[in-house]
C-alpha cells in the first residue's frame, strides 16, 4: 500500500480542501472511525488500484486516524493497513468529543491505560488533573491518543489553553475492578561478564504491595547462597525490586537466572529468566565472511561493512596500506562503529565518490586488552571502459588496418565487427564478428598493458583487412564488468578516391 502524502502525521488548515490517495495491487479503501467515507476508486491500466479521499472544508472534527486497507484482504498475504493521523487546528473546537463509553475506564488488572482526551492542534499544551485538584499530574501525553499511564481509581480531567481561554475536557472515571496478575521483568546490567567481574540482576514487579521473591541461579545448586536485596522504588508507586548481586563471578556462574514472584492474596505468581555468560577472558569474533577482494566503481560511493562480536567493548581502527584512517574533513571517508546489541558491533568504512587512489589494501582491527581480530581485503576500483581512439590506415603492403585503443578496469574485452551493406546496417543486418582464426580476410593483433599509476588496463588492438572491395563499416566494442563503449569507422577500398 502506498499513501500520499505519506504522513504518518499531517497538520492541515481549517476550511481547506485536502486530497489523500492510497494505491495498491488489489482494491483499496479509506476508513475513518470504522466506516468508509465517500471516496473515488479507480483501476489503472497497469493493474494498480487507487482510492482518492477528498476532505473538503476541513474543521477540527476531522482530526483523527485515517486508515487505508485492502478492500478484500482474504486473498492477500498480509492484512496490510496504513495509518495516517490528521490534525486540523481549530480554535472553535476544544477537546474532541468522546463516546460515552470512553469516559468510563474499567480495569481488571494493573495495566497501563489511556485517558483519551485529544485536541485538534499538536502544538497545544495539555495537562491532566484529578477532577478536584489543580496540580498537573506527571503523565506522558500523546496528542494522537491522550494520557497513558497507570491510574488509580479516581476521576480525571484534561485542561488546555486555546488563545486566552482555558478549556476543560469531560471527566473520565477510572474503576479498578480487581487486582490481578503479577507482571515480572528481569534485566541484567550485563549478560556477558569476564571472570572476576560482578553479576548484577534486577527483578521488578509493578502494581503489588506485598510480594515474595525467589531466585534460582547456578551457585544456589552448589549450596552457595547469595542474599538478594529488596527495595521499593519510591518515585514509582508499587514498583518493588529485588537485586541479586554476585561479586567476582566465576565460570561456574554461567547459566540461567530465574526470578519467581508470588503474592498470597490471590495466589498469583509469575517468573522470568535470563541467561548470563561468564567468560574466561574478553573476546573479539568476526561474524560472517568478507571476501578478500572487494570492488568499488569509480566516482560512486561504497560502504564496506564488518560485523563482529566483542566483550568488553573494543577499540576499532581502519588502515589503508598500513596507514591509519580517520574521518576526512573533506567528507571523502566516513568511519563508524555501532553497537547493535550488547556484544555485537557493526563497523563501516564509507568511501564517498571513490577515486582511483583509494584502491589498495584495507584492514579493520578490533581489539581490547584481552583479544584482537583483524580483517583485510584488497579494494579494486572498477573503471568503465572507454574507446580512446579508432583510426584507419592503409600502408603500402596493400592491406588496410584499423587500430582501436581503449582503457578500463577490470581488463576490457575487445570485439570487432563489420557490416558491408551500409544502408541496411546495423538495423536490418546484424554485423559480422571479425578476427576469428578461421577468417582469412582479417587478422587481429591485440596488446594489453596495465598502467600502475592509473590502476587500469589499456588495450590496443589492430585489425588487418586483406581485401576491401567496397565500403565497410568497422566497429570496435570494448566491454568490461562495469560498462561498454563502441566506436565505428568506415573503411573504403584503395581504388575509391575518397573516404567517408
Amino acid at each position: 500500500l502506498v499513501v500520499t502524502p505519506p504522513g504518518p502525521e499531517l497538520v492541515l488548515n481549517v476550511s481547506s480542501t485536502f486530497v489523500l490517495t492510497c494505491s495498491g495491487s488489489a482494491p483499496v479503501v479509506w476508513e475513518r472511525m470504522s466506516q468508509e467515507p465517500p471516496q473515488e476508486m479507480a483501476k489503472a491500466q497497469d493493474g494498480t488500484f487507487s482510492s482518492v479521499l477528498t476532505l473538503t472544508n476541513l474543521t477540527g472534527l476531522d482530526t483523527g486516524e485515517y486508515f487505508c486497507t485492502h478492500n478484500d484482504s482474504r486473498g492477500l498475504e498480509t492484512d496490510e493497513r496504513k495509518r495516517l493521523y490528521i490534525f486540523v487546528p481549530d480554535p472553535t473546537v476544544g477537546f474532541l468529543p468522546n463516546d460515552a463509553e470512553e469516559l468510563f475506564i474499567f480495569l481488571t488488572e494493573i495495566t497501563e491505560i489511556t485517558i483519551p482526551c485529544r485536541v485538534t492542534d499538536p502544538q497545544l499544551v495539555v495537562t491532566l488533573h484529578e477532577k478536584k485538584g489543580d496540580v498537573a499530574l506527571p503523565v506522558p501525553y500523546d496528542h494522537q491518543r491522550g494520557f497513558s499511564g497507570i491510574f488509580e481509581d479516581r476521576s480525571y480531567i484534561c485542561k488546555t489553553t486555546i488563545g486566552d481561554r482555558e478549556v476543560d475536557s469531560d471527566a473520565y472515571y477510572v474503576y479498578r475492578l480487581q487486582v490481578s496478575s503479577i507482571n515480572v521483568s528481569v534485566n541484567a546490567v550485563q549478560t556477558v561478564v569476564r571472570q572476576g567481574e560482578n553479576i548484577t540482576l534486577m527483578c521488578i514487579v509493578i502494581g503489588n504491595e506485598v510480594v515474595n521473591f525467589e531466585w534460582t541461579y547456578p551457585r544456589k545448586e552448589s549450596g552457595r547462597l547469595v542474599e538478594p536485596v529488596t527495595d521499593f522504588l519510591l518515585d514509582m508507586p508499587y514498583h518493588i525490586r529485588s537485586i541479586l548481586h554476585i561479586p567476582s563471578a566465576e565460570l561456574e556462574d554461567s547459566g540461567t537466572y530465574t526470578c519467581n514472584v508470588t503474592e498470597s492474596v490471590n495466589d498469583h505468581q509469575d517468573e522470568k529468566a535470563i541467561n548470563i555468560t561468564v567468560v574466561e577472558s574478553g573476546y573479539v569474533r568476526l561474524l560472517g565472511e568478507v571476501g578478500t577482494l572487494q570492488f568499488a566503481e569509480l566516482h560512486r560511493s561504497r560502504t564496506l561493512q564488518v560485523v563482529f562480536e566483542a566483550y568488553p567493548p573494543p577499540t576499532v581502527l581502519w588502515f589503508k596500506d598500513n596507514r591509519t584512517l580517520g574521518d576526512s574533513s573533506a567528507g571523502e571517508i566516513a568511519l563508524s562503529t555501532r553497537n547493535v546489541s550488547e556484544t555485537r558491533y557493526v563497523s563501516e568504512l564509507t568511501l564517498v565518490r571513490v577515486k582511483v587512489a583509494e584502491a589498495g589494501h584495507y584492514t579493520m582491527r578490533a581489539f581490547h586488552e584481552d583479544a584482537e581480530v583483524q580483517l583485510s581485503f584488497q579494494l579494486q576500483i572498477n573503471v568503465p571502459v572507454r574507446v580512446l581512439e579508432l583510426s584507419e590506415s592503409h600502408p603500402d603492403s596493400g592491406e588496410q588496418t584499423v587500430r582501436c585503443r581503449g582503457r578500463g578496469m577490470p581488463q576490457p574485452n575487445i570485439i570487432w565487427s563489420a557490416c558491408r551493406d551500409l544502408k541496411r546496417c546495423p538495423r536490418e543486418l546484424p554485423p559480422t564478428l571479425l578476427g576469428n582464426s578461421s577468417e582469412e580476410e582479417s587478422q587481429l593483433e591485440t596488446n594489453v598493458t596495465y598502467w600502475e599509476e592509473e590502476q587500469e588496463f589499456e588495450v590496443v588492438s589492430t585489425l588487418r583487412l586483406q581485401h576491401v572491395d567496397r565500403p565497410l563499416s568497422v566497429r570496435c566494442t570494448l566491454r568490461n564488468a562495469v560498462g561498454q563503449d563502441t566506436q565505428e569507422v568506415i573503411v573504403v577500398p584503395h581504388s575509391l578516391p575518397f573516404k567517408v
Epitope: 486530497v19 473515488e40 479507480a42 489503472a44 477528498t54
Partner: nanobody, 123 residues
C-alpha cells in the same frame, strides 16, 4: 509516468470564450485529480480550477467562479476548461496538472504537469 498535453489556447476578444483541453497519456486516467493553473510573466502559478477523479468535486478560484467550468472525460483521458466571459486579466499561460496529494489549491500538491498553452484576451 503521465504525460499531459494542453491545447485550445489562442487570442480572443474580451467577453469571448475558449475551451482548453488537456490530454493525458501513459497511464489510466480514472485515478488522478486534474487541475488548471495559470501564470503571468513575473508571477508564480496560480490555481484556477480542479476536478476529482469521478467528477464528484470541483473547485474554483473565486475570480473565475461562474465564468469557467472544469470537466473531464475519463473515456478519452481528457480534462477540459470552458472559459466564458473572458477578461484581459485572464491573459496567461494555462497549465494542466495531474495527480494531487495534498491541498487541492497548491501547485506543490501535483505530481505531473503539461507544457502550458497561451491564452491572450485583448480588450
Amino acid at each position: 509516468e503521465v504525460q499531459l498535453v494542453e491545447s485550445g489556447g489562442g487570442l480572443v476578444q474580451a467577453g469571448g470564450s475558449l475551451r482548453l483541453s488537456c490530454a493525458a497519456s501513459g497511464r489510466a486516467f480514472g485515478g488522478p485529480y486534474m487541475a488548471w493553473f495559470r501564470q503571468t510573466p513575473g508571477k508564480g502559478r496560480e490555481f484556477v480550477a480542479a476536478i476529482s477523479p469521478s467528477s464528484v468535486y470541483t473547485f474554483y478560484q473565486d475570480s473565475v467562479k461562474g465564468r469557467f467550468t472544469i470537466s473531464r472525460d475519463n473515456t478519452k483521458n481528457t480534462a477540459y476548461l470552458q472559459m466564458n466571459s473572458l477578461k484581459p486579466e485572464d491573459t496567461a499561460v494555462y497549465y494542466c496538472a495531474a495527480e494531487a496529494a495534498g491541498e487541492v489549491r497548491l501547485e506543490t500538491s501535483y505530481k505531473y504537469w503539461g507544457q502550458g498553452t497561451q491564452v491572450t484576451v485583448s480588450s
